[in-house]
C-alpha cells in the first residue's frame, strides 16, 4: 500500500496472506472457513495461508496449507477479466475475534462510497520496501466513466475503480488479491494498476465481487 | 544485484530444438513475468511469448504457437524457452526479459538477459 | 495487432544535435507506449515508459511526448554514446506486445 497507515489492529479479521514458502506472494479474503476469495491471477500450485494476526511472518498466527484453487472459468490472461479465485483451505479455520469471515455483498455499492483497501504489499515504488504491519488506506469507489478516461478500453465490466483525486495512495505489488472493504462489505479484491504505483490519478482497479456471488456460493457448494 | 543471466550459444540443424534457460537473481522471482524477445541479425525485436513465473500462465505469439514453449522452475529461479523445428529463419539472438507492474498487468521491460545466439544451419 | 511504425528507420546527426524519432501507432494505444536504445551486441535498455516518464539512471536529455497515436523520443543534445538503435513498443493491447521497425541513429 502505498501512502497508507498502519491499521488498527484486529480490524481486518478477514484478511489473509498467500505465502509461498515464507515469502507473501498475495492478499486474500476469508469467505468461510474452509475458504479463502482472492485474484485468479494470484494462482500457485499450493499455499500457505496466514491468518489472524496482523503481522506478517507471525509465529501466533494461524497457517494452514491449500491445495486446492477455483479459478474463475471466463479469468483472461489476456484482458485480465474475471480476476477472481476461490482457494479451499486443506483444514477448517479456528474463528474467534481475530479470524472471521468477511460479509459478501448485497448490492454493488455507488461511486463516491469510501471504502478501504489494505494489505502487506510494498509501501514504495519501483524500489519496494515491505511492511511487517497490514496497511490500509482509505479510497473512494470511481464511476466506470471516469475511470475509463485513465485506462480506455482496458476497463472490463466487472472492474472496480478506487482512489483519490490527486493523491499517490493506492495498492502495489503483494496487495494482489486483498479486500477492498465499503460499508462492512467486500466489493472489490486488488487487482492491478499503473506502475510505479502511486501515480496521482491513477484509480487502482479491483474485481468487482457484487458481480460475482452466485459464483463464489456455487464454486463453495460443488467443492464441499 | 539484480540481474537475468541466460545459457550460451547454440548451433542447431533445422528441425531440432533448442532450449534456452534464464537464471534470475536479486530479486523476486515468483513476483514477476519473463518474456522472450528475439532479434534475428540486422533485424529488429520480435516478442515471442511471456510466462508467470508463479503461476506458469503463458501467452505465445500466434506464429510460434505449437512450437514453443515456456516453463520456470521457482526453485532455481529459472526461466526457460524451448523452440521445435527449427528453421533456418529462426537464426536470432534470443533475449529474456522481465516485466514491470503489479497485480494482473505489466506494462515494460526493465531487466533484459544478455541474450543467447541461437543458429540454425545444415 | 497493433502495428507500431517507426520513423525515420535511419538517421544521420552531429554531437550536439537535436534528435526526434516518431512512433505511430495502428490505433490508439493511450500513453502506454515505452522506448528503448540498444547498442550493438547489447540487449535493450528501458530509456521511457508510459510514453513520457524518465526511467530512473536516463540522462535527462532524453524525452518522450504524445498519447493516443503519435508519439515522439526527442535527445535533446545528442551525445557520442547516443548513438544506438531505438525501438518502441505498445503494452495497451497485449498479448501480443508489438514493437516498432527501430531507428538507427548514426554519426554524420
Known amino acids: 500500500i502505498i501512502d497508507g497507515y498502519k491499521c488498527k489492529e484486529g480490524s481486518h479479521p478477514w484478511q489473509v496472506a498467500l505465502l509461498k514458502g515464507n515469502q507473501l506472494h498475495c492478499g486474500g479474503v476469508l469467505v468461510d472457513k474452509y475458504w479463502v476469495l482472492t485474484a485468479a491471477h494470484c494462482k500457485m500450485g499450493q499455499y500457505q495461508v496466514q491468518l489472524g494476526s496482523d503481522k506478517i511472518g507471525d509465529q501466533s498466527a494461524q497457517k494452514i496449507k491449500a491445495t486446492k484453487s477455483f479459478r474463475h472459468p471466463g479469468y483472461s490472461t489476456k484482458t485480465h477479466v474475471n480476476d477472481i479465485m476461490l482457494v479451499r483451505l486443506d483444514e477448517p479455520v479456528k474463528m474467534s475475534s481475530k479470524v472471521e469471515a468477511v460479509q459478501l455483498p448485497e448490492h454493488c455499492e455507488p461511486p463516491g462510497t469510501s471504502c478501504t483497501v489494505s494489505g502487506w504489499g510494498t509501501t514504495t515504488s519501483p524500489d519496494v520496501t515491505f511492511p511487517s504491519d497490514l496497511m490500509c488506506s482509505d479510497v473512494k469507489l470511481i464511476s466506470s466513466r471516469e475511470c475509463k478516461k485513465v485506462y480506455k478500453d482496458l476497463l472490463g465490466k466487472t472492474m472496480l475503480c478506487a482512489g483519490i483525486p490527486d493523491s499517490k495512495t493506492n495498492t502495489c505489488n503483494g496487495d494482489s488479491g486483498g479486500p477492498l472493504v465499503c460499508n462492512d462489505t467486500l466489493q472489490g479484491l486488488v487487482s492491478w494498476g499503473t506502475y510505479p504505483c502511486g501515480q496521482p490519478n491513477d484509480p487502482g482497479v479491483y474485481t468487482q465481487v457484487c458481480k460475482y456471488k452466485r459464483w463464489v456460493m456455487e464454486t463453495m457448494k460443488t467443492h464441499r | 544485484q539484480v540481474q537475468l543471466v541466460q545459457s550460451g550459444a547454440e548451433v542447431k540443424k533445422p528441425g531440432a530444438s533448442v532450449k534456452v534457460s534464464c537464471k534470475a537473481s536479486g530479486y523476486t522471482f515468483t513476483s514477476e513475468g519473463i518474456h522472450w524477445v528475439r532479434q534475428a541479425p540486422g533485424q529488429g525485436l520480435e516478442w515471442m511469448g511471456s510466462?508467470?513465473?508463479?503461476?506458469?500462465?503463458?501467452n505465445y505469439a500466434q506464429k510460434l504457437q505449437g512450437r514453443v514453449t515456456m516453463t520456470t522452475d521457482t526453485s532455481t529461479s529459472t526461466a526457460y524457452m524451448e523452440l521445435r523445428s527449427l528453421r533456418s529463419d529462426d537464426t536470432a539472438v534470443y533475449y529474456c526479459a522481465r516485466s514491470a507492474g503489479y497485480g494482473a498487468r505489466h506494462w515494460y521491460f526493465d531487466l533484459w538477459g544478455q541474450g543467447t545466439m541461437v543458429t540454425v544451419s545444415s | 495487432d497493433i502495428q507500431m511504425t517507426q520513423s525515420p528507420s535511419s538517421l544521420s546527426a552531429s554531437v550536439g544535435d537535436r534528435v526526434t524519432i516518431t512512433c505511430r501507432a495502428s490505433q490508439s494505444i493511450s500513453s502506454y507506449l515505452n522506448w528503448y536504445q540498444q547498442k550493438p551486441g547489447k540487449a535493450p535498455k528501458l530509456l521511457i515508459y508510459?510514453?513520457?516518464s524518465l526511467q530512473s539512471g536516463v540522462p535527462s536529455r532524453f524525452s518522450g511526448s504524445g498519447s493516443g497515436t503519435d508519439f515522439t523520443l526527442t535527445i535533446s543534445s545528442l551525445q557520442p554514446e547516443d548513438f544506438a538503435t531505438y525501438y518502441c513498443?505498445?503494452?495497451?493491447?497485449?498479448?501480443?506486445?508489438?514493437f516498432g521497425g527501430g531507428t538507427k541513429v548514426e554519426i554524420k
Open positions: 510466462i508467470s513465473a508463479s503461476s506458469g500462465d503463458t
Open positions: 513498443d505498445q503494452w495497451y493491447s497485449t498479448p501480443p506486445i508489438t
Open positions: 508510459g510514453a513520457s
